[in-house]
């Protein structure tokens, strides 16, 4: 089975490379997941996303867990997913009404 | 216990080709990417290029673009460098070393370098 | 390309003292910088990641701070084996340059 996911192999300083232009097939029976690397800098925040096998985006994202503090200076969050493009922006939040 | 060892190095002529081996073991290069780092004798560390074994996605530094080719032979656990139009100012010690691609991570093991002499 | 300039470009010290090496990155590179030792005719050994994190094995009289532009690499109390060349790389962007060394010699 084949995933897309979104990939963007330089930081992009506030873009999250989570457009159409972005999406590449990966390769099959190997990258089995999406990995997104989100690291916040004093310049702002930057991104990192590519096809991953499972077992080097587990390795990451396990090794690396205690560098993850969301919305501090210097956190890097590394995430790994399975579903088609779900390295791609996070979902908007519905307004209650 | 995880061990990189390059091997190919040699004396070549300016305009030839070499190709250079990091076999690893201890480990799956699947998992990390390789990065190819060269030292000109009594001089500082140039990344050369690096790859994701995994997909096969490749970056070189300026000074080797469109000279130099980085494979992977995943069945053999072996990263390649394959050195063409070579130059004298290409004569250094060749190390491969793995990184995990988080961008925290650093080369955590390297091999023990093998010497390419560009020399006619 | 972000330049990652280290200085002294040399030193010379005595055993027991305190060292000290600065890295300073053209731009912000937060706290994707590792620090390595050689010594002549072998590979470089990674000492410090992520800016300040010692690595496996590694003495603990090494210690790296710094992040965003300015990073340093102490050495408290030099032993003798620590007479070698150090590098500071950063691991964020691509190429992931290195400094362009800083040996240190005995004085």
């Known amino acids: 089975l084949q995933i897309q996911c979104y990939q963007c192999e330089e930081f992009q300083l506030n873009n999250d490379c989570s457009s159409p232009e972005f999406i590449v097939n990966c390769t099959v029976n190997v990258q089995d997941m999406c990995q997104k690397e989100v690291m916040e800098q004093s310049a702002g925040i930057m991104y990192r996303k590519s096809c991953a096998s499972s077992a080097a985006c587990l390795i990451a994202s396990a090794g690396y867990q205690s560098f993850c503090s969301p919305g501090k200076l210097n956190s890097v969050c590394i995430s790994c997913c399975n579903t088609p493009l779900c390295n791609g922006p996070r979902p908007k939040k519905r307004g209650s009404s | 216990e995880v061990q990189l060892v390059e091997s190919g190095g040699g004396l070549v002529q300016p305009g030839g080709s070499l190709r250079l081996s990091c076999a690893a073991s201890g480990f799956t290069i699947t998992n990390y990417g390789i990065h190819w780092v060269r030292q000109a004798p009594g001089k500082g560390l140039e990344w050369v290029g690096r790859i994701y074994p995994d997909s096969g996605a490749t970056y070189y530094a300026d000074s080797v673009k469109g000279r130099f080719t980085i494979s992977a032979d995943t069945s053999k656990n072996t990263a390649y460098l394959q050195m063409n139009s070579l130059r004298a100012e290409d004569t250094a010690v060749y190390y491969c070393?793995?990184?995990?691609?988080?961008?925290?991570?650093?080369?955590?093991?390297w091999g023990q370098g093998t010497l390419v002499t560009v020399s006619s | 390309d972000i330049q990652m300039t280290q200085s002294p470009s040399s030193l010379s010290a005595s055993v027991g003292d305190r060292v000290t090496i600065t890295c300073r990155a053209s731009q912000d590179v937060s706290t994707a910088v590792a620090w390595y030792q050689q010594k002549p005719g072998k590979a470089p050994k990674l000492l410090i990641y992520s800016a300040s994190f010692l690595y496996s094995g590694v003495p603990s009289r090494f210690s790296g701070s710094g992040s965003g532009t300015d990073f340093t690499l102490t050495i408290s109390s030099l032993q003798p084996e620590d007479f070698a060349t150090y590098y500071c790389?950063?691991?964020?962007?691509?190429?992931?340059?290195f400094g362009q060394g800083t040996k240190v010699e005995i004085k």
């Open positions: 790389q950063r691991s964020v962007f691509t190429p992931p340059a």
């Open positions: 070393a793995r990184k995990l691609w988080v961008s925290l991570a650093a080369m955590d093991y």
